[in-house]
């Protein structure tokens, strides 16, 4: 069976990715776009979150608007707000099924029953992570087939944000805690009947010889 | 201050051509994209070409109506786009406009180019 | 090829009305959308970039919206010296054509 160690270690990996979860779902910066214009003081930054958009003009003054509506988002924003809201919450449930089945907690008597419920929390946590991976690195894919499409204009590229290096690192260490935990072995203790039974049955054996 | 000064426009010959100059000021030329967009008299604004910068390798793009009939060109180190306008026909007759970056953020005052016999 | 088709052709407006106008474009182009505004004898000035961001010294009354193939560009309390031809464009994108126009005349 896994050490405490390692199941301390995988639940607290698995927390900090969900925490990141949470923070690149947050963060207005999943796309940058530096608007350069040729009269340096209408250069603007753009940043694109999942529920707002923020202008940083040339001055340094920001201004932040929340989306008017699901329509105001981009298509792959929307399908990731969708993901990364799941992965929140799929999260969360791994996060409860790792305290019922954490070996320093009474939830579960059955020492059997807790290795289990660490192995379901540790498949959830893989799932989760797997989930903030994909709208991420699409996003990612869809910034970097633009920066090298000779149809876009120079000066007008779109750059990855913050929040995809977050999201990056949420997944990661998703899947790394999720692994940890699915190390957890059930424990192979023999059943008591079974050990009398064999017991009885080698007795009788050697009363027949 | 930005400015952007076109040349080269006036009267030509129906099948004739023109070549058209834009020189500009006040920012980093060789950093942003040129276009050129016309406007016949009356009528909205239709964008003819634009010419990306070196690290684009200088992509140029055109409205697919006038790609066999325009060419454009750039000299970073004169600050200078061009223009160049075969085979000309009378509706080509249009107020000719330089512009910088994308979106076109700032415009010249535009030169007059008319074709008629 | 790309086709951007604003409505209305034109619309006479009272000073203090609220305006809004219209920009279809052909197939998705995203929020890759810029608003001009042209007054008689002048040269086009950029108002909106990417749908729904003002230009720099543009007045907070101007708001763009829209995402996909369909956009607005809404002027609230109209002044007089709104009355030009606005035209939307497609932008980031070649080809980097212009809608027909909509002419906003003060009534």
């Known amino acids: 069976m896994a050490s405490m160690g390692l199941q301390v270690m995988g639940i607290a990996l698995a927390v900090l990715g969900w925490l990141a979860v949470m923070l690149c779902c947050a963060l207005p910066m999943w796309r940058v776009t530096a608007f350069i214009g040729s009269n340096i003081v209408t250069s603007q930054t753009i940043w694109e979150g999942l529920w707002m958009n923020c202008v940083v003009q040339s001055t340094g003054q920001m201004q932040c608007k929340v989306y008017d509506s699901l329509l105001a988002l981009p298509q792959d924003l929307q399908a990731a707000r969708a993901l990364v809201i799941i992965s929140i919450i799929v999260a969360a449930l791994g996060v409860l099924l790792s305290v019922v089945g954490g070996k320093c907690t009474n939830c579960l008597e059955d020492e059997s029953a807790k290795a289990k419920t660490m192995i379901v929390a540790g498949v959830v946590f893989l799932l989760a992570g797997l989930m903030v991976i994909v709208p991420v690195s699409w996003t990612a894919h869809n910034i970097i087939q633009d920066f090298y499409n000779p149809l876009v204009a120079s000066g007008q590229k779109r750059e990855m944000g913050a929040s995809l290096y977050v999201g990056w690192a949420a997944s990661g260490l998703l899947l790394l805690g999720g692994g940890l935990l699915c190390c957890n072995c059930p424990p192979r203790t023999d059943k008591p009947y079974s050990a009398k039974y064999s017991a009885a049955r080698s007795a009788a054996a050697s009363n027949y010889v | 201050e930005v400015q952007l000064v076109e040349s080269g426009g006036g009267l030509v010959q129906p099948k004739g051509s023109l070549k058209l100059s834009c020189g500009a000021s006040g920012f980093g030329f060789s950093s942003y994209a040129m276009s050129w967009v016309r406007q016949a008299p009356g009528k909205g604004l239709d964008w003819i070409a634009t010419?990306?910068?070196?690290?684009?390798?200088?992509?140029?793009h055109y409205a697919e109506s006038l790609k066999e009939r325009v060419t454009i060109s750039r000299d970073d180190s004169q600050s200078m786009v061009y223009l160049q306008m075969n085979n000309l026909k009378t509706e080509d007759t249009a107020f000719y406009y330089c512009?910088?970056?994308?979106?076109?953020?700032?415009w010249g005052q535009g030169v007059m180019v008319t074709v008629s016999s | 090829n790309i086709v951007m088709t604003q409505s209305p052709k034109s619309m006479s407006i009272s000073v203090g009305d609220r305006v809004t106008m219209n920009c279809k474009a052909s197939?998705?182009?995203?929020?890759?959308i810029a608003w001009y505004q042209q007054k008689p004898g002048q040269s086009p000035k950029v108002l909106i970039f990417y749908a729904s961001y003002r230009f720099t010294g543009v007045p907070d009354r101007f708001t763009g919206g829209g995402y996909g193939t369909d956009f607005t560009l809404i002027i609230n309390s109209v002044q007089a010296e709104d009355a030009a031809f606005y035209y939307c464009?497609?932008?980031?994108?070649?080809?980097?054509?212009f809608g027909a126009g909509t002419k906003l005349d003060l009534k």
């Open positions: 197939q998705n182009v995203g929020n890759n």
């Open positions: 512009t910088v970056n994308i979106p076109f953020d700032n």
């Open positions: 010419i990306s910068i070196k690290t684009q390798n200088y992509a140029t």
């Open positions: 464009q497609r932008i980031y994108n070649s080809p980097y054509t």
